[in-house]
């Protein structure tokens, strides 16, 4: 299964969106910082495409969640969540094609299960962070830059992988 | 590779004006913060300020706001720091460093050569 | 601003020794502390960063601990190389300050 290019500008329009809904200095903010405990080993290049799939798709879908919530909707501009919300589906809907297309459905299921349960395990610890700073502006701001830089990696693997081929 | 690379040595007169850049390259640019460090000869490290180089957002020290201006130029993966009348005060060696922002990783993990301003009349 | 107080400011130390510098906040910092080692002549170098997390490629004889308000920066055998002055940096709120320097000298 090959992911559209327009899949990699999707992921760039995606980043630049999170950039512009910074809402407040993040100067103010440095003392939120936190260690959510990124999956990285699960986006290692080890892994071939079959198994990255469900893990990518996950990856995305679990940011979705996150910022679909009321609480999400009240910190961050209406307009922009709009569109971050159509580029997610978008790739959503790319990753999701190639799930369908059998990629990696009889290849090493337990480890692929794996990788998914650290992701979620790792949106929890996001949304628990949250939920513990009473979703104070500076704790959005911390965890859209951690975002940030998880999607980023992500997609430096869906990038590497393309280039593999 | 990460890089920092400092612009060259000064040596200027009291009153001048001066900038000298800080190159980021081997790195997302606008994803780390750029700080900026004076140690005047002989002495110890001061925090002077920071910037953001995605949309240029600073913050200075006390001691040196109104003194100096910081920016940066993303768009050629370089920071800024300026003076618009020198003292001989300001003779010292000034770095530039690395910071990661908001996020769980080293502050300060790469620091630039150093730039000497030397100003005397 | 947070005042960053560092002890001793200078040390005479023999290769193999166990040196510990200390670098005490005016104010509860949680474990927002990093520690540079600077040569005459060099740009300072990263060495413990939130505390007690050793940066990569610094050797593990460097060992970073404490919280709050107190903190220690250790060297379990002191290297001819180690001989240098460290500093430590709170990145807890702005502006950073750093400690004043602590000299480590060969006795």
């Known amino acids: 299964c090959d992911l559209p290019q327009t899949h990699s500008l999707g992921s760039r329009r995606t980043l630049m969106l999170l950039a512009q809904m910074r809402r407040i200095s993040l100067f103010s903010c440095l003392k939120d910082r936190h260690d959510f405990g990124f999956p990285q080993e699960e986006f290692g290049n080890q892994f071939q495409k079959a198994e990255t799939i469900p893990v990518l798709h996950e990856m995305i879908q679990q940011i979705f969640n996150l910022f679909s919530t009321k609480d999400s909707s009240a910190a961050w501009d209406e307009t922009l969540l709009d569109k971050f919300y159509t580029e997610l589906y978008q790739q959503l809907n790319d990753l999701e094609a190639c799930v369908i297309q059998g990629v990696g459905v009889t290849e090493t299921p337990l480890m692929k299960e794996d990788s998914i349960l650290a992701v979620r395990k790792y949106f929890q610890r996001i949304t628990l962070y949250l939920k513990e700073k009473k979703y104070s502006p500076c704790a959005w701001e911390v965890v859209r830059a951690e975002i940030m830089r998880s999607f980023s990696l992500s997609t430096n693997l869906q990038e590497s992988l393309r280039s593999k081929e | 590779e990460v890089q920092l690379v400092q612009s060259g040595a000064e040596v200027k007169k009291p009153g001048e004006s001066l900038k000298i850049s800080c190159k980021g390259s081997g790195y997302s640019f606008t994803s780390y913060w750029i700080g900026w460090v004076r140690q005047m000869p002989g002495k110890g490290l001061e925090w002077m300020g920071i910037?953001?180089?995605?949309?240029?957002?600073?913050a200075y020290s006390p001691s040196f706001q109104g003194q100096v201006t910081i920016s940066a130029d993303k768009s050629i993966s370089t920071a800024y720091l300026q003076w618009s009348s020198l003292k001989a005060s300001d003779t010292a060696m000034y770095y530039c460093a690395r910071h990661p922002g908001l996020n769980w990783a080293p502050d300060f993990d790469y620091w630039g050569q150093g730039t000497l301003v030397t100003v005397s009349s | 601003d947070i005042q960053m107080t560092q002890s001793p400011s200078s040390l005479s130390a023999s290769v193999g020794d166990r040196v510990t510098i200390t670098c005490r906040a005016s104010q509860s910092i949680a474990d927002f502390l990093n520690w540079y080692q600077q040569k005459p002549g060099k740009a300072p170098k990263l060495l413990i960063y939130f505390a007690s997390s050793l940066q990569s490629g610094v050797p593990s004889r460097f060992s970073g601990s404490g919280s709050g308000t107190d903190f220690t920066l250790t060297i379990s055998s002191l290297q001819p190389e180690d001989f240098a002055t460290y500093y430590c940096q709170q990145s807890h709120s702005f502006p950073l300050t750093f400690g004043q320097g602590t000299k480590v000298e060969i006795k």
């Open positions: 910037i953001d180089p995605s949309d240029s957002d600073t």
